[in-house]
């Protein structure tokens, strides 16, 4: 009996430009003889419903149809037919199929590969054209993929134990696509500093599929208006 097992859940997520390993494990009732077996990896893009060959291994012959693609013959002996793709790009997302032939048996498995790019975030203070005691804080998130992103503003006063989400005076602009396929977006918070307590901490909180935990940039309102003490907490996919 020949069986192939891919990533549990059927989806793998990898950061842009990473050297990704797409998992494929072979289970066979007898020891594997790599000279009499074949491995072929196929890729089907998200945009075109056409499957193309990425890598092929047959006995003493192997060929990469995608530059740098490799299946380790040494690992193959122990049943690991995982495909390594260096420098993965956004457009290489899609369905990958691992096909194994141990004559006369054939088995295959598929996995969805998602390529993500983590946002960078920065906080800016824009006082141009603002009234006295009124400030506009801009939270810029850039270089992220996919497009779906959630930007919220929170404040934490001295007395209350938990943050409070701010919904008023927040405007989040449209996402803008960059030349490399990633996206940028800016969210603005308008504050009347004379109505706020000194010591209140404001945060721009960015949530994205590429982040294990939100990306936060904060500033503290001081008696002398504000101190833009930006602190960023990044925890990218690894």
């Amino acid at each position: 009996d020949l069986k192939v097992e891919m990533m549990a859940g059927g989806t793998q997520i990898t950061p842009l430009n990473d050297n990704v390993t797409i998992f494929c494990n072979i289970f066979y009732s007898q020891p594997l003889n790599i000279t009499s077996m074949g491995i072929t990896w196929f890729w089907k893009s998200l945009t075109f419903d056409k499957e193309v060959k990425v890598f092929e291994f047959f006995g003493d012959h192997q060929e990469a149809f995608r530059p740098g693609a490799i299946v380790s013959p040494w690992r193959l002996k122990s049943g690991d037919a995982s495909l390594r793709l260096p420098g993965i790009q956004l457009e290489e997302a899609g369905e990958y199929r691992c096909e194994v032939v141990v004559t006369p048996l054939k088995a295959q498995g598929t996995v969805q590969l998602e390529v993500v790019a983590s946002p960078a975030s920065r906080l800016l203070l824009d006082q141009v054209g603002m009234k006295e005691n009124e400030d506009k804080y801009m939270c810029e998130s850039s270089g992220f993929y996919p497009e779906a992103i959630n930007i919220t503003w929170e404040k934490q006063t001295q007395k209350f134990p938990h943050p409070i989400e701010i919904s008023e005076d927040v405007i989040t602009g449209p996402t803008i696509k960059n030349m490399d396929g990633t996206f940028n977006v800016t969210s603005c918070l308008k504050l009347n500093s004379s109505q706020e307590d000194p010591g209140t901490v404001y945060q721009c909180v960015v949530r994205h599929a590429s982040l294990h935990t939100p990306l936060r940039s904060n500033f503290t309102l001081t008696a002398a208006r504000h101190s833009l003490s930006e602190t960023e907490k990044t925890d990218n996919f690894s």
Epitope: Q156, K159, P161, H162, P163, I164, E165, P214, K233
Partner: antibody
Framework: QVQLVQSGAEVKKPGASVKVSCKAS????????MNWMKQAPGQGLEWIGG????????DYNEKFKGKVTMTVDTSTSTVYMELSSLRSEDTAVYYC??????????WGQGTLVTVSS | DIQMTQSPSSLSASVGDRVTITCKAS??????VAWYQQKPGKAPKSLIY???NRYDGVPSRFSGSGSGTDFTLTISSLQPEDFATYFC?????????FGAGTKLEIK
Amino acid sequence: QVQLVQSGAEVKKPGASVKVSCKASGYTFTNYWMNWMKQAPGQGLEWIGGIYLNGDSTDYNEKFKGKVTMTVDTSTSTVYMELSSLRSEDTAVYYCTRRGDYFGDFWGQGTLVTVSS
Amino acid sequence: DIQMTQSPSSLSASVGDRVTITCKASQNVGKYVAWYQQKPGKAPKSLIYSASNRYDGVPSRFSGSGSGTDFTLTISSLQPEDFATYFCQQYISYPLTFGAGTKLEIK
């Protein structure tokens, strides 16, 4: 990192007073407000009151007014909560708590006060 | 004072189960609700703030929802370490008030 270390367990007689301390470290002490919570054995949580750590402001739950006094010693970064005229229903674990960060609010380890004759 | 009525008061469940705890406020508290987990002999640990936002480090199996007066905490797939007591708390105004707690036990 932020740490709130409370004084040890106390056993008191009815009518006596007790002063529980909470020593803070790992942050600029006077910038914060400290809350105190009560948890009677097997019961839920009750907010007793709070104090601004520069010492200029307190806020007590009506239920505990006359029972509790909160003070601050900024030189040692310590907050105190004194409970007076103790009765058996004051037997509880008392916690000091401070507003949090990304990981939630901070709590002391708790101080068990037992009122028993 | 704002009353927070939590239900059920106790609950038996098995590892892998989906569990929902509810909390009802006596008046509109917006989204100013937090959820805590407490294990015996330990201080409470905050899980959720603003009704639905998970604190960093809290597993994704914990989720909160609701606004106004009705709130829920859901654990999508119970793990052995989740057996504890859970409290809701309103923080829209002083005095801060808590629900009476829900004790989650192993079936």
